[in-house]
């Protein structure tokens, strides 16, 4: 009975998490992006990024932008604005 309860609670929590984060936000480092944001972000908003690769346990390729508001936003690596920010951030790292 207790196991059923905790399973139910876990299921409820993950549904809630998905609802809060939407498909375009990664809830944690261990979550996969399921879709992409439909917004354009400014480089000043972004502190870093990680790459999600489809062949490494997730369904889609994505760039996960980490923002100054502690949000992780899933973005389409094929879009120009995403490539631009990745290039900017990569340059910054090289120049450090």
């Amino acid at each position: 009975m207790c196991c059923t309860k905790s399973l139910l609670l876990a299921a409820l929590m993950s549904v809630l998490l998905l609802h809060l984060c939407g498909e375009s936000e990664a809830a944690s480092n261990f979550d996969c992006c399921l879709g992409y944001t439909d917004r354009i972000l400014h480089p000043k908003f972004i502190v870093g990024f990680t790459r999600q690769l489809a062949n490494e346990g997730c369904d889609i390729n994505a760039i996960i932008f980490h923002t100054k508001k502690k949000l992780s936003v899933c973005a389409n690596p094929k879009q120009t604005w995403v490539k631009y920010i990745v290039r900017l951030l990569s340059k910054k790292v090289k120049n450090m």
């Epitope: 917004r39 400014h42 000043k44 100054k68």
Partner: antibody, heavy 120, light 107 residues
């Protein structure tokens, strides 16, 4: 020099659609976004959405979602903005404006504007 | 969406005056702010980008400052051609919202 030339004024009936064009010249068309901004009589500037001519990616303001469509023809360096289900509140001057990553995502060049009048 | 609030909404000033227009964002926009000038019957013109940078061809009497949620456009010595409406714009994240505008009129 950079130029954005828009199509002429339009008069439309409520419920109809309008399609405004914006022809770009003087720069590499696919390297810059194109925004659409409108100004209704006595009102301020209102951002409608943006299109990336390199891949036709679009994002629209929530207010226009489902009513606006932005498209691009790279062969003629032209961007189009179509607004459907027109109502009297859509009477405004519509501008295309080039979006420039290099100058902090600013709109650095603007078309001359297209007056769209919605009247029965 | 991020809301932008400009003040004042209108302002009367004389040639030679120093004028300040303020723009407040509903949340921190980290300097992702641009200023535009619009004259009647003309397309808007970019004045300041990235909160502080002067756009090409814009006279040095225009300057921008601010950070976080609060930003300012200053005209150090008003010229006759500066009487127009000024708009701030958030570009941190779409939708790129504008302030409601500040109309600068001749006193």
């Amino acid at each position: 020099q950079v130029q954005l030339v828009q199509s002429g004024a339009e008069v439309k009936k409520p419920g109809a659609s309008v399609k405004v064009s914006c022809k770009a010249s003087g720069y590499t068309f696919t390297n810059y976004w194109m925004h659409w901004v409108r100004q209704a009589p006595g009102q301020g500037l209102e951002w409608m959405g943006v299109i990336d001519p390199s891949d036709s990616y679009t994002t629209y303001a929530q207010k226009f979602q489902g009513r606006v469509t932005m498209t691009v023809d790279t062969s003629t360096s032209t961007v189009y903005m179509e607004l459907s289900s027109l109502r009297s509140e859509d009477t405004a001057v519509y501008y295309c404006a080039r979006g420039n990553y290099g100058v902090d995502y600013a709109m650095d060049y603007w078309g001359q504007g297209t007056l769209v009048t919605v009247s029965s | 969406d991020i809301q932008m609030t400009q003040s004042p909404s209108s302002l009367s000033a004389s040639v030679g005056d120093r004028v300040t227009i303020t723009c407040g964002a509903s949340e921190n926009i980290y300097g992702a702010l641009n200023w535009y000038q619009r004259k009647p019957g003309k397309a808007p013109k970019l004045l300041i980008y990235g909160a502080t940078n002067l756009a090409d061809g814009v006279p040095s009497r225009f300057s921008g400052s601010g950070s976080g949620r609060d930003y300012t456009l200053t005209i150090s010595s008003l010229q006759p051609e500066d009487f127009a409406t000024y708009y701030c714009q958030n570009v941190l994240i779409t939708p790129y919202t504008f302030g409601q505008g500040t109309k600068l009129e001749i006193k």
